[in-house]
Structures are given as C-alpha cells and as structure tokens.
C-alpha cells in the first residue's frame, strides 16, 4: 500500500493545483530562491565517528586493516584544503580548531574549491533540468529497489551534522539502475529552504522546489567508498522533490517528528525502521538521469543522479518543521542547505520517458534536441 | 525461568515521587531493550517508556504523557530496572508493568515477557 | 500518534465456537502487530507476533492474521479458559500504542 501522498502522474514542476502551467512565471526563482555566489554547495559534510560515507558525510580513512569490507565513517579520505583559491563560488569555511575534518558551510570562505578542489571540476550537481532539452532513452528501465521495506528493529541513526539531517541506512538495501548497475543504499538526507523560500537543490526549468530528498548509494563494485569516488557510476544519488500538499505524509512524518531531539548540531538520536520506499515517489518508471558530482565537498565527480520525475508531497506543517527545527554552526538556523545549480557544460540529461514530447506544458512545440546516450548501455 | 518482579508501588499524593524498580532474572538482561507499560483501573494497556540496551548505549524513550516527570533507567550489573516518576498526577494512578522487549536478534518491538505489576495510586 | 481500534469491544460466544476479532490500524504498519491475552488480576501475555507468528507455549487454537492496517484474532475453537480479554499492540512505531482491548464473554 502506498498512503496517498504523491502526486499522482503530473510532470516534474506540476503542484497538486493541477493548473496548466505549473511552471509559470510566478514559480520562477527570484534572487533569494537560489543561493548566490556565496550561497554554497551541498551539505554533505565529513562527520563524527560513526557515521556512514555518503553525499553527506564523508568521514576520513582509517587503515585498511579494519574491516577491510564493511562501509564505515573511515570510507572517505580527508579533504585536504589546497593553498591556492580558486573561483569563490561555492564558499565553506573551516572550523576555528583548524581540524582536518574541513568543516565548511554554505556562505563564507573559503571557496569550495579550496577546501576541494574537485568542487572546481566540469561535471558538478546540482543542475537546471529543461525536459524539453532531455535526451529520452527508452533504455532507462524502470527502478529496482530490494529490501528497503525495513523492521522497526534494529532502529536507525538520524543524526543533525549541521548541514542536514541524515539518516544512516543499514546493510542489505539494493538499488538498480539497470542490468549490471547496483547498488547499495548508504544514507539518506534532506535539502530545504527557509520559510517562504523553496530549497531543492535541482531545479527544473529554473523553479526551485520546497525540499529534496538524496538517497545515496555505493556500487557493488567497489568494497568502500574511498575507491568509489570519482569514479563513473562509483556512487549513485535518487533525488526526489519534496512538494506541499493537502495531507500529513506518514511516512516522513516518522523523521520530521524527531527533529527536535536532534536540534542542536552534531546531536543524533534513534528511530525504528521504516518503509525507506515510501519516502520516494512511488513511480519508479519516470525520471531524469546525468552524471554529476556529490554538491558538498568534496564535489567528487561521476556521480550518477536519478532524479524523479513525480514528486512527494508533505503537509505544510511538516515543510515549516523541516526547515525551522534544526541548528547549524555558529548558532544559525539550519536553513537554505543547498549548492547553486552548476554548468552542464556539454552534458545531456537522458529521461527515461519522452519529456519533452508531452509532459512539459509551457512547450509551444517539442524539441527533442538530444539523443539518447544510453542506449545499448 | 525467565521472570519479571516489580516493586516500589504505593499510595502517594499528587505532586509526589515515588520509584518503582524492576528484578531479572532467567535471561541475558543486558542485550534486551526493558520497557513499562501501566494499565488504569478497568482501563486498557499503555506504554510508558523503554531503555534501550548497552548496545544501543542505555538510551530512553518516553511517552507524551510522562515525559519531563518520569526517568526510566537500568543496572545491568544488577539485573534490575528502574522507573522514577515525578510530579505524580491522579491519572498516573495504574498498575505497572515491568516488561521485556525486543533485542539485537530480534527485529520488531513486542513485548514477551510482563512481570506481575505493582500498583501506583495517586490521590489526596 | 498510531490509533488502534478493535472490534468488536464485547463478544460473545459458546465454548467451541470460532471468533474472531478485528484490529484496524490508523497507518500502514506492514505486519508489526502483536496480540495479547489478559485474563482478570494478570498481567497480560503475548499470543502472536509479526502479525501471525504464535508465541512459544500459545495453543494451536490461535492463529493472527493480516497487514498494513487490517488484522485479525481468530480463535479456532473457544476453551473456557479463552473467555477473557485481548489486545492488539502496533511495533512499527514509537509511542507504542494498544487497541482500547476486546472482552470475550460466555453467551
């Protein structure tokens, strides 16, 4: 059963007002809807012990010699900050104790590409998707997820690191993204706005959205997340909207209600297991697909993105606690977590359906610009 | 035999404190997660709080209604669980029940074990 | 907070006789359901888990069924002993909560 939360088929951009033009001009970002240039990246940071690698938190190595094959903090290396800076973008900051830990935020120095210089690199998420300009591959199969239905027991790590919440996941949930593409489910995490101002980090035709979700995911290829980085298809993000609707999503109301336990920064507590599926669009057929970058340092590229094209709907209460319950550093609100939209330079974005054909209501005439990359993959 | 003992009930007056503790015995106290559950008078069950075992590092978890009065905790060098309820009102007047709960090899709260209960009367 | 509703509230029924009884969940619980027995001055005892999982010494008599938010309680063939009350208790989620409990009488 899936509680009736999604919107059921309205392309990507459509509220549950069902208007026509749900992209229109009032939807477009004024300048406070997209963080400027020093309204940086993304928030995955490189957290406490614990914690499990992922576009989040991207612990530092330990030796290898410690469980060599179980995915721990130590799964991702140290970000180094390079002396030179470079374009002051996306700005992080470091701790005052000068840890190795690059401890950064979004506004404020230095320039990401300083605490990573891969922040610097071509290929960077988030990014603006224009269906019209998708490549549409009818090769992208519809989504494989396995065991993401899980027990209340054992429960699970939710944990405030002072750029998102993030949920720890446990062994044992796959994802495919097609024949001879899986993966395995690491953590999730949530990007919002403040009151009033949309937070998503993709944007589609320019319209932010209030929230998204990230769902990161290792390659069964790789042992750890450390040799996974930067390497094409190493890691994998599902990214769904977060829309407002008329009704309270049980699903997420399991997370939202334990915010305020975790308020202050760096605070964690526990939560039972729960349907992680049911906190994603329940169609699985329809998204977009690039390569990318994690949108926190360390920015590492060959990212895979699926981004889907329904989006999940949350009351207005549970939007408003999202995004006003949780602290930051230096006793801010944890608010506007999300990284500018970057270049595309040259990529194509590849939809799994024809989007460009008849989902997108603002066309006066398809374009289908692209062809599909994917195909024969 | 794997049981549940529970002592510390009485009659107290609103306002008042009183702690109830809980006895072990017959399994491995330490791996389990130990929750109360209290039963008004002609009333059905309601779950009152549980602490999590030494592996999920001894934390609590409270129903709304208790929650800021009372304070579960644990000895495990002892076998024994405790429930210290503060600022009492008339509605926490109920039998309570010292319960087992879910472990490491399990993977779904339920409650398979109840001790016999104790009773807590709160009146003027 | 995760409502449970049993019913019926009363029933009543003849030695031998197969009932059943309902819980209806407010939200999707998947099969995190428990039943338990409580007979007058005792504490309560777990009957099934996991929706249909008979507990360890519970007679055959009784079987649990259902998932998401329909469950049910049957008792095969009443025993004088089973003329007590029953509750059902959702495990998905915290506040654990009870169904307000179903009385079985002798007709």
């Known amino acids: 059963q899936r509680l009736p939360r999604m919107q059921e088929d309205s392309p990507l951009g459509g509220g549950s007002s069902g208007e026509d033009d749900p992209l229109g001009e009032e939807d477009l970002p004024s300048e406070e809807d997209s963080p400027r240039e020093e309204d940086p990246p993304g928030e995955e940071d490189l957290p406490g012990e614990e914690d499990l690698p992922g576009e989040e938190d991207l612990p530092e190595v330990k030796p290898k010699s410690e469980e060599e094959g179980s995915l721990k903090l130590e799964d991702l290396p140290t970000v180094e900050a390079p002396g030179d800076p470079q374009e002051p973008q996306n700005n992080a900051h470091r701790d005052k104790e000068g840890d190795d830990q690059s401890h950064w935020r979004y506004g404020g120095d230095p320039p990401w590409p300083r605490v990573s210089p891969a922040c610097a690199g071509r290929f960077q998420s988030p990014v603006d998707i224009r269906p019209q300009l998708a490549a549409f591959c009818p090769a992208l199969r519809p989504l494989e997820l396995l065991g993401f239905q899980l027990p209340p027991l054992p429960e699970l790590r939710l944990r405030n690191n002072g750029h998102s919440v993030q949920l720890t996941l446990p062994p044992g949930l796959e994802m495919a993204l097609g024949p001879g593409r899986e993966y395995r489910a690491l953590q999730l995490h949530l990007h919002w706005g403040a009151a009033g101002r949309p937070g998503s980090e993709h944007t589609v035709e320019g319209h932010r959205f209030p929230a998204e979700i990230h769902v990161v995911h290792l390659s069964t290829a790789f042992a750890r997340v450390d040799e996974a980085l930067g390497r094409p298809g190493g890691l994998a993000v599902l990214a769904a909207f977060l829309e407002e609707g008329p009704e309270e999503n049980s699903a997420y109301e399991q997370l939202l209600s334990r915010l305020e336990e975790i308020a202050e920064e760096g605070s964690e507590t526990q939560v039972p297991g729960l349907d992680i599926s049911a906190l994603l669009p329940s169609d699985f057929s329809r998204y977009f697909q690039y390569e990318g970058s994690l949108t926190t340092p360390p920015c590492a590229q060959g990212v895979i993105w699926t981004v889907f094209n329904q989006t999940v709907m949350l009351s207005a209460k549970q939007l408003h606690t999202l995004s006003d319950t949780l602290w930051g550093p230096g006793d801010s609100r944890l608010q506007l977590n999300f990284r500018a939209t970057q270049p595309l330079n040259g990529r194509v974005i590849e939809a799994s359906f024809p989007a460009g054909v008849d989902s997108s209501p603002r066309a006066a005439e398809p374009v289908q610009l692209n062809s599909c990359l994917a195909a024969g993959d | 035999e794997v049981q549940l003992v529970e002592s510390g009930g009485g009659l107290v007056q609103p306002g008042g404190s009183l702690r109830l503790s809980c006895a072990a015995s017959?399994?491995?106290?330490?791996?389990?997660?130990m929750h109360w559950v209290r039963q008004a008078p002609g009333k059905g069950l309601e779950w009152v709080a549980f602490i999590r075992n030494k592996a999920s590092g001894y934390t609590p978890q409270y129903s709304a209604s208790v929650k800021g009065r009372f304070t579960i905790s644990r000895d495990d060098s002892k076998n024994s669980l405790y429930l210290q309820m503060n600022s009492l009102k008339i509605e926490d007047t109920a039998v309570y029940y010292c319960?087992?709960?879910?472990?490491?090899?399990?993977?779904?709260?339920?409650?398979?074990?109840w001790g016999q209960g104790t009773t807590v009367t709160v009146s003027s | 907070d995760i409502q449970m509703t049993q019913s019926p509230s009363t029933l009543s029924a003849s030695v031998g006789d197969r009932v059943t009884i309902t819980c209806h969940v407010s939200?999707?619980?998947?099969?995190?359901l428990s039943w338990y027995q409580q007979k007058p001055g005792n504490a309560p005892k777990l009957l099934i888990y996991?929706?249909?999982n008979l507990h360890t010494g519970v007679p055959s008599r009784f079987s649990g069924s259902g998932s998401g938010t329909e469950f049910t309680l049957t008792i095969g063939s009443l025993q004088p002993d089973d003329f007590v009350t029953y509750y059902c208790?959702?495990?998905?989620?915290?506040?654990?909560?009870f169904g307000q409990g179903t009385k079985v009488e002798i007709k």
């Open positions: 017959g399994f491995t106290f330490t791996d389990y997660y």
């Open positions: 208790q959702q495990g998905q989620s915290y506040p654990f909560t």
């Open positions: 939200q999707n619980i998947n099969v995190w």
């Open positions: 319960v087992r709960g879910g472990h490491a090899g399990s993977n779904y709260w339920y409650f398979d074990v």
């Open positions: 996991q929706a249909s």
